[in-house]
C-alpha cells in the first residue's frame, strides 16, 4: 500500500518545511485516495471487461451512490461553501458502506482497498473540523447500511464485479468534484 500523506521520504528529508495548512492537508489526502482508487481500478479493469461494459444500468438500479448536483452548491453556478461542505461530508459518510463492500473484493490490492477505506475516514475527520454547521450532516443509519451490505454481497459474480467497478468510478468522480470545490474555498 502507498505511504499515507505526510509520511513519505520527502517529508522526512525536509524537516524545516512549513507544516501543511488544513486545506493543503485535505488536498493531499484526497489526491492520495485518488491514487489508491486508480490502483484498484487497474486491477478491476484487468480482471474483467467491466470498464468497457455498456450494461451498467443493470447494476446501478441496486446502488444509490452519492453524486454532486447543482443544488449541492459545489459547482460554479450557485457555489455555496457551507452547503457544499455539508454535501461533501454527507456524501463521504454515505460512501463508507460501499468502501466496506470493496474489502475482500481484491486479490493483489487488498492492502490498497483497506488504505482507501482508512484514508477516507481520516478525510472525513479533517473536513468535519473545517465545517461550521455539523448539525446539517446526516449520518447513515447503521441498520440500513448492514442490510445494504448483505444485499450487495448476495449478488451473482457478474453483478458483484459491476458493482465494484461502479463504486470505484462514482467515488473517483465524487472526490474529483469535491476537491475542485474545496480548491475554491
Amino acid at each position: 500500500a502507498p505511504v499515507p500523506p505526510g509520511e513519505d521520504s520527502k517529508d522526512v528529508a525536509a524537516p524545516h518545511r512549513q507544516p501543511l495548512t488544513s486545506s493543503e492537508r485535505i488536498d493531499k489526502q484526497i489526491r492520495y485516495i485518488l491514487d489508491g482508487i486508480s490502483a484498484l481500478r487497474k486491477e478491476t479493469c484487468n480482471k474483467s471487461n467491466m470498464c468497457e461494459s455498456s450494461k451498467e444500468a443493470l447494476a446501478e438500479n441496486n446502488l444509490n451512490l452519492p453524486k454532486m448536483a447543482e443544488k449541492d452548491g459545489c459547482f460554479q453556478s450557485g457555489f455555496n461553501e457551507e452547503t457544499c461542505l455539508v454535501k461533501i461530508i454527507t456524501g463521504l459518510l454515505e460512501f463508507e458502506v460501499y468502501l466496506e463492500y470493496l474489502q475482500n473484493r481484491f486479490e493483489s490490492s487488498e492492502e490498497q482497498a483497506r488504505a482507501v477505506q482508512m484514508s477516507t475516514k481520516v478525510l472525513i475527520q479533517f473536513l468535519q473540523k473545517k465545517a461550521k454547521n455539523l448539525d446539517a450532516i446526516t449520518t447513515p443509519d447503521p441498520t440500513t447500511n448492514a442490510s445494504l451490505l448483505t444485499k450487495l454481497q448476495a449478488q451473482n459474480q457478474w453483478l458483484q464485479d459491476m458493482t465494484t467497478h461502479l463504486i470505484l468510478r462514482s467515488f473517483k468522480e465524487f472526490l474529483q468534484s469535491s476537491l475542485r470545490a474545496l480548491r475554491q474555498m
Epitope: R31, L34, M68, F75, Q76, K172, Q176, S177, L179, R180, R183, Q184
Partner: nanobody, 124 residues
Amino acid sequence: EVQLVESGGGLVQAGGPLRLSCTVSGRTFSTYAMGWFRQAPGKEREFVADINWNSDNIWYADSVKGRFTISRDNAKNVMYLQMNSLKPEDTAVYYCAADSYGVGGGKEEYYDSWGQGTQVTVSS
C-alpha cells in the same frame, strides 16, 4: 505525461471572436481535467477557465465569465477556448494545462503538464 500544443492565436480587433485549440497527445486525455491560463506582458500567469473530464464541471475567472466558453472533444483529444467580445486587456500568451488527477483549479500548481502557449493580441 502528455504533450500539449496550443493553436489559434493571432491578432484580432476589439469586440471580435477567436477560438483557441489545445491538442493533447496521449490515450489518457479523457481522464484529465484541462485548464486555460494566460500571461499578459509584465504580469503573473492567471487562471482563465477549466473543465473536467466529461464537461459537467466548468469554472471561469470572473474577468471572462459570459464572454469565453471552454469545451473539449474527448474523441479528438482537443480542448477549445471560444473567446467572444474580446477586449485589449485580453491580450496575453494563452497556455493550456492538464491535471492528471482530473480535478483542475485556479492555481498553476494543480496542473502537471503545460503547453508552450499561443499569443493573442487584441487591438483597439
